[in-house]
Interface confidence: low
């Protein structure tokens, strides 16, 4: 999946299985990928699961679990809020649209979730005060944690590379070395560009990422993830000069 | 105490549901709870100096992770939620949020806090 | 065969020193701590403290804190501990024991034990 | 005194079963996996019989089963046989510090 970090790094990420992707003493969120494609390098979240931890008067530990084409509105024991505490308001989940979009609030930490189901794969964002990110036992360790550090380099694809190379080359296809299997051929590059540019009319990362992901996997969908994943970060993005971001020299994960 | 290693053994013992030697088609995933088991060691680490069973923890972890072929880089395992403990009132560090009222939203000292974002999305 | 192998008894004049040595076998020596327990006879049995042999922390059980020592030599696999300030209560049999690691937390081998005798 | 208290003896005729208690307080013993049983013969080192509470090492008869309920531990010997006769340490770790029982003295009528 393409990952936007803590520190607006953009990745694209083919690590597959459970990953972290924050950790901290307040909130735990994994994730797992799964191929898009058999044989696909491009992995997609197909599972994300997000524990909110026992916290003072306030709220009782509370799990909250989506997968493909299950998107509750609850948290695992059925509840919507933090628990029978006197602050468990404080902690709720409000369904935005049935099965496709949900919001978690926990106030007491002053962070906000959105979990959204996009054709068959999960969408995840936050917004989540610095403070929270850095209440974490041991700052050194924290190498795994997606959010936190990005990927591991060798985990990385470089979507922006293969962009430049696809760019107004007709319906020139994925190469050899493409991340993953040639996508139907219903799908050449100016289509690709086109059916982006309708939702995404800043050429940025989202929008390179949505043409990469149709290259990719031909799925139309994936315009959906990158659109309301800018939507998101219009919500829930701090700094409103930072919504889009731009093609430059990738980072380096930290370490 | 501070140092949390039984938090750690016991999200490790319950991860691997207490097969201390997997079959061999369940080595990727008992790979996978070895390498939670090691994040979680590191993170404590600082607090855990002198501890018996944080070094112990260590040793085991090398040990295991060297008899079963585990690379060190690679997915963790997801969490048993069951086990997972609260970070309850008798762990609240100094760092903690300070929350006077569960339905406030977060402050510090009454300061606005830096938000960060992240997201994940597509392939 | 994992085995722990001690050396032999001991008499000392109260306020000497003893240091009692434990050498392990058919493991890896570094990868299991070893911890010290005494038996003052016809008692129980009384935790006196650990050591790592991979790092050389030491954890020590607090009425013993400032006259314990443990040290281990990794290039004989052997471990060591010393105990000062000796009375006349000390006297004991000393046993070293290997700890399981991990989560598996115990003592699984032990050592056939040291006979320290504090006497003036 | 013990941290962790233990019956001082308990007996049985051979292929009866016993049971051995060790209590102590919550951090020690009701929160902790870290609960290990030892049998000693007279002269000889302490033997692991039991550790994480229930677990047994190889070589241990499953005649010696462990559970814990609340902040007591116990250690049953089902079908008792002569050779079981012997002293029975419960130990727990806790915190930083690693508790032993006082001792139970098992004794084959």
């Known amino acids: 999946p393409h990952l936007r970090t803590f520190t607006d790094r953009f990745q694209t990420c083919k690590v597959q299985g459970a990953w972290p992707l924050i950790d901290n003493n307040y909130l735990n969120v994994q994730v797992t990928n799964t191929p898009v494609l058999p044989g696909s390098a491009a992995t997609a979240t197909s599972k994300l699961t997000i524990i909110f931890k026992n916290f003072q008067e306030c709220v009782d530990q509370k799990v909250y679990q989506a997968e493909m084409d299950e998107l509750p509105a609850a948290f695992v024991d059925g509840s919507k809020n933090g628990g029978d505490k006197h602050g468990a308001n404080s902690l709720k989940i409000t369904e935005k649209v049935s099965g496709q979009h949900v919001e978690i609030r926990a106030k007491y930490i002053g962070t906000t979730i959105v979990v959204r189901q996009v054709g068959r794969y999960l969408t995840f964002a936050v917004r989540v005060p610095e403070e929270v990110v850095n209440a974490v036992e041991d700052w050194d360790s924290q190498g795994l944690y997606l959010c936190l550090r990005g990927c591991p380099l060798n985990q990385q694809i470089d979507f922006q590379a293969f962009h430049t190379n696809t760019e107004g080359t007709g319906a020139r296809r994925l190469a050899a070395a493409s991340p993953a299997p040639t996508a139907p051929e219903t799908f050449p590059y100016e289509t690709a560009v086109a059916k982006c540019k309708e939702k995404l009319p800043v050429e940025d990362l989202y929008y390179q990422a949505c043409v990469f992901d149709l290259l990719t996997t031909g799925d139309v969908n994936f315009t959906l993830a990158a659109y309301y994943a800018l939507e998101d970060v219009k919500m829930l993005h701090s700094n409103k000069d930072k919504l889009h971001l731009y093609e430059r020299t990738r980072d380096l994960p930290g370490r | 105490s501070p140092c949390k290693i039984l938090k750690c053994n016991s999200e490790f013992w319950s991860a691997t549901s207490g097969s201390h030697a997997p079959a061999s088609d369940d080595t990727p995933e008992f790979c996978a709870a070895l390498r939670s088991y090691a994040l979680c060691t590191r993170r404590t680490a600082r607090t855990c100096r002198g501890d018996l069973a944080y070094h112990s923890a260590v040793h085991g972890i090398e040990d295991l992770m060297s008899q079963h072929n585990c690379s060190k880089d690679g997915p963790t395992s997801q969490p048993r939620l069951h086990t997972l403990p609260p970070a309850g009132d008798s762990q609240e560090r100094s760092d903690s949020p300070e929350i006077c009222h569960c339905e406030k939203s977060f402050h510090k000292h009454s300061a606005t806090p830096n938000y960060t974002h992240c997201g994940l999305f597509g392939d | 065969e994992v085995q722990l192998v001690q050396s032999g008894a001991e008499v000392k004049k109260p306020g000497a020193s003893v240091k009692v040595s434990c050498k392990a076998s058919g493991y890896t020596f570094t990868s299991h701590g070893i911890s010290w327990v005494r038996q003052a006879p016809g008692q129980g049995l009384d935790w006196m403290g650990w050591?790592?042999?991979?790092?050389?922390?030491?954890n020590y059980a607090q009425k013993l804190q400032g006259r314990v020592t443990m040290t281990t030599d990794t290039s004989t696999s052997t471990a060591y501990m010393e105990l000062s300030s000796l009375r006349s209560e000390d006297t004991a049999v000393y046993y070293c024991?290997?700890?399981?690691?991990?989560?598996?937390?115990?003592?699984?081998?032990w050592g056939q034990g040291t006979l320290v005798t504090v006497s003036s | 005194q013990s941290a962790l208290t233990q019956p001082r003896s308990v007996s049985g005729s051979p292929g009866q079963s016993v049971t051995i208690s060790c209590t102590g307080t919550?951090?020690?013993?009701?929160?902790?996996?870290?609960v290990s049983w030892y049998q000693q013969h007279p002269g000889k080192a302490p033997k692991l019989m039991l550790y994480?509470?229930?677990k047994r090492p190889s070589g241990v008869p499953d005649r010696f089963s462990g559970s814990k309920s609340g902040n007591t531990a116990s250690l049953t010997i089902s079908g008792l046989q002569a050779e079981d006769e012997a002293d029975y340490y419960c130990c727990s770790y806790a915190g930083t510090d690693t508790l032993f029982g006082g001792g139970t003295k098992v004794t084959v009528l």
């Open positions: 919550s951090s020690s013993v009701g929160d902790s996996i870290y």
């Open positions: 994480d509470v229930t």
């Open positions: 050591i790592s042999p991979y790092s050389g922390n030491t």
């Open positions: 024991a290997r700890v399981g690691s991990g989560p598996y937390y115990y003592m699984d081998v």
